[in-house]
């Protein structure tokens, strides 16, 4: 019995087609992805093949103005239109709190939304009961397939799930649910979830009875053969894991941002054993036409976004200096504002011993592309912020050793004076440079804000200690020559859209007046 699994993950609000790098579409003839194009390909496969499931492995939320404005209603609407069969909860589905998940998505979705390792307690338990499920048995042709969901247990550190949701260990939570499916005579089981490729592989290895793992969170690109675009494969598609009980379990993921549609064909025998598995992600490029009816719907929804872009988010009573003459040479108040917003967006009081789980921010000065003049009545709009942060990136959470941070700050000024983008703006860090010294030895003082303290204060950086840092995804991926970050990071979780982080902060503060205050000397 052959099953076709179509899958997406980490779409992050890319409802419209995008450029090849998943930023805003400029030249339509070379754009990719988007739900209208996705629908064309899905329908084509549904017409050609008998047993098809369309699955999403989480993180539909967060990433463009679509989410900022529609807050998840757009996800429910267009996923319903595409007739998704199931979705797993990702960490970003909790970005607007539990209410921001329940009302727009859980109550509106016409498909099951799954996670076996999230347990509700207290008053929330009855409110959310039945709105998401640990598993769902789906009829597919003459057969049935069990889908069991999972979500990163790091979600409380990455998003805003509140205090009434407990995130359990994935493997511990999945095994009893899979066992339950087996007692219901369901012998074809897909684990669909959002914990990253390493956990996906562990689930394939450790959870008895899971036949296929469809994952997300790590934006992993897998491909067999010559890849069709710029993404470099982390392994073959599907990636085969040998389980502890001796079965070959295919593990798949489909990069991110709706650029690809994962396409996996599985042949099962009567016992539910995977006899064969093969496929590849399908690049959703311009050779695939956008479905006209979905495209028309997108255009209808688009109108509200254009109006939103020019509305006031808040006010500044000072000049927001985002000029390259400042931000690539010294501490600039636009850099301070952005870093403050980045830390504020990551406030998570999950432990009494810590005032927060992260206190530090670094930001490449070259990523700040425009100032904002306060003389326009102080008004700040989304449009203004889009000029400051035009690249559509995210502000991510990483874990780095102190020694890596020291290297990063040396790199920040290794060719100081040439107006290069690697000069770092900071938050929760005091750095002192001596530019008379030779490159690689210019950082003379590096103090960082404590987290395990009730009164935050600055302490000298310890080389062997592991620190959490918020930074742009551009830096996490080694951009501007920060190869040491990419090579030495111990953990990397993708965060919220850069503009959204700053706009939310400005809306929250209402009036802002960031200063240059001696963070960089």
């Amino acid at each position: 019995w052959e099953l076709t699994i179509l899958h997406t993950n980490d779409v992050h609000s890319r409802l419209e087609q995008t450029s090849e790098d998943s930023s805003k579409c400029v030249n339509a003839s070379r754009c990719m992805g988007g739900v209208a194009r996705l629908f064309t390909k899905v329908q084509q496969i549904r017409r050609a093949e008998p047993n098809v499931l369309l699955l999403d492995a989480g993180d539909q939320y967060q990433g463009t103005i679509w989410f900022t404005v529609y807050k998840g209603a757009e996800v429910a609407h267009f996923m319903n239109a595409l007739r998704y069969d199931a979705m797993a909860l990702g960490n970003h589905e909790f970005d607007n709190g539990v209410e921001g998940l329940i009302e727009p998505l859980l109550k509106e979705a016409k498909f099951p939304i799954l996670s076996a390792n999230i347990k509700a307690k207290g008053p929330l338990a009855s409110q959310i009961s039945g709105l998401y499920l640990p598993y769902k048995v789906l009829p597919v042709g003459d057969e049935v397939v069990g889908i069991v969901g999972y979500t990163s247990k790091e979600t409380p550190f990455l998003s805003n799930p509140g205090t009434n949701l407990v995130f359990e260990d994935e493997i511990t939570a999945l095994q009893p649910e899979v066992d339950k499916l087996k007692t219901l005579n369901v012998n074809k089981i897909i684990a669909l979830g959002h914990s990253g490729f390493e956990m996906d592989k562990l689930i394939a290895q450790k959870v008895r009875g899971v036949d296929v793992v469809v994952g997300g969170h790590s934006n992993t690109f897998l491909y067999t053969g010559n890849p069709p675009s710029k993404e470099v494969p982390a392994g073959k598609y599907p990636f085969i894991v040998t389980s502890d009980d001796g079965r070959k379990v295919p593990v798949v993921q489909a990069y991110a941002f709706g650029k690809y549609l994962g396409y996996l064909k599985i042949e099962f025998d009567e016992r539910g054993n995977v006899i064969s598995s093969h496929g590849n992600p399908i690049l959703l490029n311009s050779s695939i036409p956008e479905d006209p009816s979905i495209k028309a719907d997108i255009n209808k929804w688009r109108i509200k976004l254009d109006n939103y872009s020019t509305q006031e988010l808040g006010k500044t009573i000072v000049y927001l200096d985002g000029s390259s003459q400042s931000c690539r040479f010294r501490e600039c108040n636009m850099g301070n504002l952005i870093c403050d917003a980045m830390i504020n967006n990551n406030l998570r009081h999950t432990d009494e011993m810590f005032w927060n789980h992260v206190s530090m921010c670094i930001l490449n000065g070259g990523g700040i592309r425009s100032p904002i003049d306060e003389r326009n009545n102080g008004t700040i709009t989304w449009e203004n912020l889009a000029a400051v942060l035009p690249f559509g990136g995210t502000f991510d959470l990483v874990q780095l050793k102190g020694s890596t941070l020291k290297k990063a700050f040396e790199h920040s000024v290794h060719r100081y004076g040439q107006s290069t983008g690697e000069f770092l703006q900071v938050g929760g860090i005091h750095v002192v440079y001596d530019l008379s010294r030779k490159p690689g030895d210019r950082v003379v003082k590096l103090d960082v804000l404590c987290t395990k303290c009730r009164v935050p204060s600055y302490d000298p950086l310890k080389m062997d200690e592991v620190y959490k840092v918020i930074l742009p995804n551009f830096l996490a991926n080694g951009g501007d020559g920060f190869q040491m970050i990419k090579d030495e990071l111990l953990r990397h979780d993708s965060g919220d859209q850069d503009i959204n982080v700053v706009s939310t902060y400005i809306s929250k503060m209402k009036v802002i007046y960031p200063a240059v205050e001696g963070r960089i000397k």
Partner: antibody
Framework: EVQLVQSGAEVKKPGASVKVSCKAS????????MNWVRQAPGQGLEWMGR????????FYSQKFKGRVTMTVDKSTSTVYMELSSLRSEDTAVYYC???????WGQGTTVTVSS | DIQMTQSPSSLSASVGDRVTITCRAS??????LNWLQQKPGGALKRLIY???SLDSGVPSRFSGSGSGSDYTLTISSLQPEDFATYYC?????????FGGGTKVEIK
């Protein structure tokens, strides 16, 4: 649990036909196919062909084409294998086996003797 | 048709021995290979499917490996109940074909 139950032993004369049945249970019958395999006394296994339960599509080994007919009765989840123009070298145990031979019938002994 | 050449055709071994049986296909068969066990009474049982996946209930002393046209069944520590005849089966293309079998006997 998958179970395949075959019909009883048969003794046939050369030139006659034999029809062996295989009743399946414990799985969604229409979603799969059935193989027929035979084993002559003291010999190895020989694949004869297969039938898809849902629509009765068949694929026969070239060696048996024209002599073998596989049919299905979806209402009783039963598959049949008929072999005609029997000769002495068709004396064998005939097995039905699921799609990828994960489960086997108990075997049906067919003796061709004058 | 794809020919499956299985070797050895028989072998004598003692309890606890490591036993290796090989099958060579006349062309590349991908991973489309099963290993079957037939006890003296005639009952057939699949041990390994898709080259290396172990059927449920089959002891972990059985393992399969290989790719292209060369495949191996290994019994890491032979047990009394393992004395039987073993067959490989390719299902990469029609007609499916079996190896000639390997009879594992007590030394």
């Amino acid at each position: 649990e998958v179970q395949l139950v075959q019909s009883g032993a048969e003794v046939k004369k050369p030139g006659a036909s034999v029809k062996v049945s295989c009743k399946a249970s414990g799985y969604t019958f229409t979603a799969y196919f059935m193989n027929w395999v035979r084993q002559a006394p003291g010999q190895g296994l020989e694949w004869m062909g297969r039938i898809y339960h849902n629509n009765g599509d068949t694929f026969y080994s070239q060696k048996f084409k024209g002599r073998v007919t596989m049919t299905v009765d979806k209402s009783t989840s039963t598959v049949y294998m008929e072999l005609s123009s029997l000769r002495s070298e068709d004396t064998a145990v005939y097995y039905c086996a699921t799609s990828y031979v994960g489960d086997w019938g108990q075997g049906t002994t067919v003796t061709v003797s004058s | 048709d794809i020919q499956m050449t299985q070797s050895p055709s028989s072998l004598s071994a003692s309890v606890g021995d490591r036993v290796t049986i090989t099958c060579r296909a006349s062309q590349d068969i991908g991973d489309s290979l099963n290993w079957l066990q037939q006890k003296p009474g005639g009952a057939l049982k699949r041990l390994i499917y898709a080259t290396s996946s172990l059927d449920s209930g089959v002891p972990s002393r059985f393992s399969g490996s290989g790719s292209g046209s060369d495949y191996t069944l290994t019994i890491s520590s032979l047990q009394p109940e393992d004395f039987a005849t073993y067959y490989c089966l390719q299902y990469a293309s029609f007609p499916w074909t079996f190896g000639g079998g390997t009879k594992v006997e007590i030394k």
